[in-house]
Structure formats: structure tokens, C-alpha cells
């Protein structure tokens, strides 16, 4: 999917409300310091597509963060904002659905929403300090 | 561990190639703008080319223009630097580096391969 | 090109704040980032956008960046800090890194 054309604004509002809540909720316990920035994006449609893919595509260390309520969320963010995103997640959304595990936040999960933590923050500073 | 590796140096003769390689591991390779650095020896640190993270841009010192490319393969993990028409003065130790960009700028440099040694002599 | 220009060498009692200059026309008005370099080893960043530190670097390393010079300042210097120091912008009218010419630091 092609990021280029959501309501950046209206993202950046509704993470700011309330997925980076439910984000910061998951990490509890974890400084921010303890992972390494892994993953980057260089603008707004480039973050969403890498926050895309960390949130909902299992990895084998890390396969349950799309149930948690943080990707629910994003889901509905993206859903609401970006024209066609919703019909375009209908066949992923269906493939999940076939391979549940069962939820165990492990420590491979947590460096992996801190990576989205990243992703986000990257997202919403629409530009470095100066330059 | 992210880490990255640079392989290839040696010793060429004046106009002759040679061509770096550097392989990323333990980060999102195609997440990251990816530059050059070189150093001879004795001296401060020079910046070679940079690559975009989609491999889309690239821009290069004017001293190397023309004569090297800076390429990605991001399905590998791997940089490239192809140097033609070597001189005396690329003698150097060469490094890669990540760097995160946004839009067009490019952050710091934070993490670095161990560096390859490229003479150039006859 | 835009150029960056450090003190040749710099030298710290152990114990006491060393400080190092970076010069640059309006260089306060981008971005700063200073990396350390030991004999036979890489460069490894030790600040970033003007004063920010990465987690790895102890808190005795810190930058500021005005005017026309940044400065990277280490207090409470210790023999394991000996080392080159280079600043270092991106600069986006000409789309180039500059790199200043290093300071070697010497602790006494």
C-alpha cells in the first residue's frame, strides 16, 4: 500500500491521543535505552510503511502484536485515514486470523515496539531541528 | 549486534579498479542512508558518497566524482563502492556507515565498519 | 563548500574540562555532530544534533552549538579519553557531509 496519499495531520493526532499510550503502556518496566535503534524511515508515507510491517507482520521471535491494542488502533488510524487502506488489508486480516499463537510478551516484542516507538517519533517531527 | 563489515581493499596500480563491499547485519539495512568515509594515513576523516536508504539518490565528493559509484542491494545487506581510475591520493582506509535520513538530510553517523585499507601505488 | 575548522590539538589535566571548538559560518544553524576516534580503531559517534548523546557515551561528554561555533566539552577528563575528535554537518545547500580537520586531545 502506498502511504502517500493519508491525512498525515489526523494520524499524527490520533497517535498522539492515543496509540502512543497504549504503546508506552505495552513497554512499562522498560527503559527506552535498553534497544538500540534498529529500524528508521527517512519520510512521513516511508514511517507508516515500516510501522505497517513491524505491527502487523509476525516475525518468528515476535508473532502476537497485531491483537494487542496498540495495532488495533493503528489499524483503525490507517483504516480512517488513508484512502484504500481498508480493502487492501482484508486478505492479510484473513491469513492472521489462520496462524494465532498464543500472547507471550516476550523480550524479542518489546524490542520490537520500541522500534515502532522510534518509527512513531520519526513520524510525527515532520522536520530535524534545523538544517 | 548490528554491525557492519568492509571487505575488498588491497593494493592497485594508478588507473586501475577496485570495488568495496560492506555487509550490514543486525539492523534494517533498507531503512538507512548508507555513506563512504575515507581516511589516509595520518590524516582526518573525508566523506566519500552517500546513498539513499531506497538507493534512489546518490552524491559523491567532489574529489571522487565521476570516478566512483556508490551502490545498495538491499535484498543482500550489502553496500558497494566501485572505484575507477584510481590515484595515489585514494590511499586510504575506507569506511561504511549508517546514517538515519530525513527528506534529503542526512543525521549522524552512528555506526561504522572497521574500516578496509586501499593503497594505490605502482 | 562550507568548511569546519578545529584546533590542531587540545590538552586536559586528568580530572579537569576539556573543550573543543568547531567553527563554521552560522554554524548554529545546523546540526552538530561530534565523533571520537582512537589509534587504529573507527570513529564512534560520542554527540549528535548539537548536545543530544547516544546511551553507550557517560554523561560527562555533552555539545552546544551557536552563533558560529559548537563546542564538545568533557568534563572530569580521564587518560581513556585521548583520543581525535572531529566534527562534523551535513550541509544541504550542496547536499555534502563536512567533516572539521580533528583535534587531538591529550590528558596530561
Known amino acids: 500500500y502506498d502511504f502517500t496519499n493519508c491525512d498525515f495531520q489526523k494520524i499524527e493526532a490520533d497517535y498522539l491521543r492515543t496509540i502512543s499510550k497504549d504503546l508506552i503502556t505495552y513497554m512499562s518496566g522498560t527503559k527506552s535505552t535498553d534497544f538500540n535503534n534498529t529500524v528508521s524511515c527517512s519520510n512521513r508515507p516511508h514511517c507508516l510503511t515500516e510501522i505497517q510491517s513491524l505491527t502487523f507482520n509476525p516475525t518468528p521471535r515476535c508473532a502476537s502484536l497485531a491483537k494487542e491494542m496498540f495495532a488495533r488502533k493503528t489499524k483503525a488510524t490507517l483504516a480512517l485515514w488513508c484512502p484504500g487502506y481498508s480493502e487492501t488489508q482484508i486478505n492479510a486480516t484473513q491469513a492472521m486470523k489462520k496462524r494465532r499463537k498464543r500472547k507471550v510478551t516476550t523480550n524479542k516484542c518489546l524490542e520490537q515496539v520500541s522500534q515502532l516507538l522510534g518509527l512513531w517519533r520519526r513520524f510525527i517531527r515532520t522536520l530535524l531541528k534545523k538544517q | 549486534q548490528m554491525q557492519l563489515v568492509e571487505s575488498g581493499g588491497g593494493v592497485v596500480q594508478p588507473g586501475r579498479s577496485l570495488r568495496l563491499s560492506c555487509a550490514a547485519s543486525g539492523f534494517t539495512f533498507r531503512t538507512y542512508g548508507m555513506h563512504w568515509v575515507r581516511q589516509a594515513p595520518g590524516k582526518g576523516l573525508e566523506w566519500v558518497a552517500v546513498i539513499w536508504y531506497d538507493g534512489s539518490y546518490t552524491h559523491y565528493a567532489d574529489s571522487v566524482k565521476g570516478r566512483f559509484t556508490i551502490t545498495r542491494d538491499n535484498s543482500k545487506n550489502t553496500l558497494n563502492l566501485q572505484m575507477n581510475s584510481l590515484r595515489a591520493e585514494d590511499t586510504a582506509v575506507y569506511y561504511c556507515?549508517?546514517?538515519?535520513?530525513?527528506?534529503?538530510?542526512?543525521?549522524?553517523?552512528?555506526?561504522w565498519g572497521q574500516g578496509t585499507m586501499v593503497t594505490v601505488s605502482s | 563548500s562550507y568548511v569546519l575548522t578545529q584546533p590542531p590539538s587540545v590538552s586536559v589535566a586528568p580530572g579537569q574540562t576539556a573543550r573543543i571548538t568547531c567553527g563554521g559560518n552560522?554554524?548554529?544553524?545546523?546540526?552538530v555532530h561530534w565523533y571520537q576516534q582512537k589509534p587504529g580503531q573507527a570513529p564512534v559517534l560520542v554527540v549528535y544534533?548539537?548536545?543530544d548523546r547516544p546511551s553507550w557515551i557517560p554523561e560527562r561528554f555533552s555539545g552546544s552549538n551557536s552563533g558560529n561555533t559548537a563546542t564538545l566539552t568533557i568534563s572530569r577528563g580521564e587518560a581513556g579519553d585521548e583520543a581525535d575528535y572531529y566534527c562534523q554537518v551535513w550541509d544541504s545547500s550542496s547536499s555534502l557531509v563536512v567533516f572539521g580537520g580533528g583535534t587531538k586531545l591529550t590528558v596530561l
Open positions: 556507515a549508517r546514517s538515519p535520513q530525513w527528506e534529503d538530510i542526512f543525521e549522524a553517523f552512528d555506526i
Open positions: 552560522n554554524i548554529g544553524s545546523k546540526s
Open positions: 544534533d548539537d548536545s
